[in-house]
């Protein structure tokens, strides 16, 4: 099934909106990259998965 992401960042940069972030996270791999490439901290993203 499709992976749906519920993610909340502590801060937004580069004029991002939560909606734009959600649109970017279309796969678990994207989520992994956001989490480990861009944030660098487990405290920066509070996320859960639902299918």
């Amino acid at each position: 099934g499709n992976l749906k992401h519920k993610c909340f960042r502590n801060s937004l940069e580069n004029n991002e909106t939560l909606e734009s972030i959600m649109n970017t996270l279309e796969s678990e791999e994207d989520f992994r990259k956001y989490f480990y490439y861009l944030e660098g901290s487990k405290d920066a993203l509070l996320c859960g998965f639902s299918t």
Epitope: S20, D30, R32, K33, Y34, Y36
Partner: antibody, heavy 117, light 113 residues
Framework: EVQLVESGGGLVQPGGTLRLSCAAS????????MHWVRQAPGKGLEWVSV????????RYADSVKGRFTISRDNAKNTLYLRMNSLKPEDTALYYC??????????WGRGTQVTVSS | DIQMTQSPSSVTASAGEKVTINCKSS????????????LAWYQQRLGQSPRLLIY???TRESGVPDRFSGSGSTTDFTLTINNFQPEDAAVYYC?????????FGQGTKVELK
């Protein structure tokens, strides 16, 4: 055929500015995270920057943070690297790379940046 | 940052020999959600761009000869070249794709004896 073609390198004085471009073709550019990786003469590979598929998320190596800006134009299938306040230690061959799943499955041929007075 | 350490820094091999290159990461590159190691190996021939050989520690990239193989998990990884060929003379790099800053090993130069 996937192709990544870098351009915009050259000789610049310390403190100067360059904008590198990477023209992508042969794949759906907007589906991929993209990176810049550089290689100083006779040295190893050094990661520079990454940008997410939509362009809203970016990150930089500490060595270039605050001086370099990565961006992309998905309508033009082009990746950019704006390089300000260039230093001699930025002298390198700059590669545009495609990120598949944490690995770089395609590399361009690179564009040479030389910072010297 | 995750540090990547390769050994040896250089090796000389004759055609037909087996070459082994090691790569150690300073912390785990195993992603628990999918149990994949985000470790890749590249070949860079003189004057050329790097070429992906192995990803996820042990998966051979399409078109790569089967004499190249990768193994290992968590923090310790190995690239093996069986039946070394003259065209395999190059510098080999490992790279972790687990977290930014993405980092490379310092490279291992493999020369033809």
């Amino acid at each position: 055929e996937v192709q990544l073609v870098e351009s915009g390198g050259g000789l610049v004085q310390p403190g100067g500015t360059l904008r590198l471009s990477c023209a992508a073709s042969g794949f759906t550019f907007s589906n991929y995270w993209m990176h810049w990786v550089r290689q100083a003469p006779g040295k190893g590979l050094e990661w520079v920057s990454v940008i997410d598929r939509g362009g809203g998320g970016t990150r930089y190596a500490d060595s270039v943070k605050g001086r370099f800006t990565i961006s992309r134009d998905n309508a033009k299938n082009t990746l950019y690297l704006r390089m300000n306040s260039l230093k001699p230690e930025d002298t390198a061959l700059y590669y545009c790379t495609r990120d598949r799943n944490g690995e770089y499955d395609y590399w361009g041929r690179g564009t040479q940046v030389t910072v010297s007075s | 940052d995750i540090q990547m350490t390769q050994s040896p820094s250089s090796v000389t091999a004759s055609a037909g020999e087996k070459v082994t290159i090691n790569c150690k990461s300073s912390q785990s590159v195993l992603y628990s959600s999918n149990q994949k190691n985000y470790l890749a190996w590249y070949q860079q021939r003189l004057g050329q761009s790097p070429r992906l050989l192995i990803y996820w520690a042990s998966t051979r990239e399409s078109g790569v000869p089967d004499r190249f193989s990768g193994s290992g998990s968590t923090t310790d990884f190995t690239l093996t070249i069986n039946n070394f060929q003259p065209e395999d003379a190059a510098v080999y790099y490992c790279q972790q794709g687990y977290s930014a800053p993405l980092t490379f090993g310092q490279g291992t130069k493999v020369e033809l004896k």
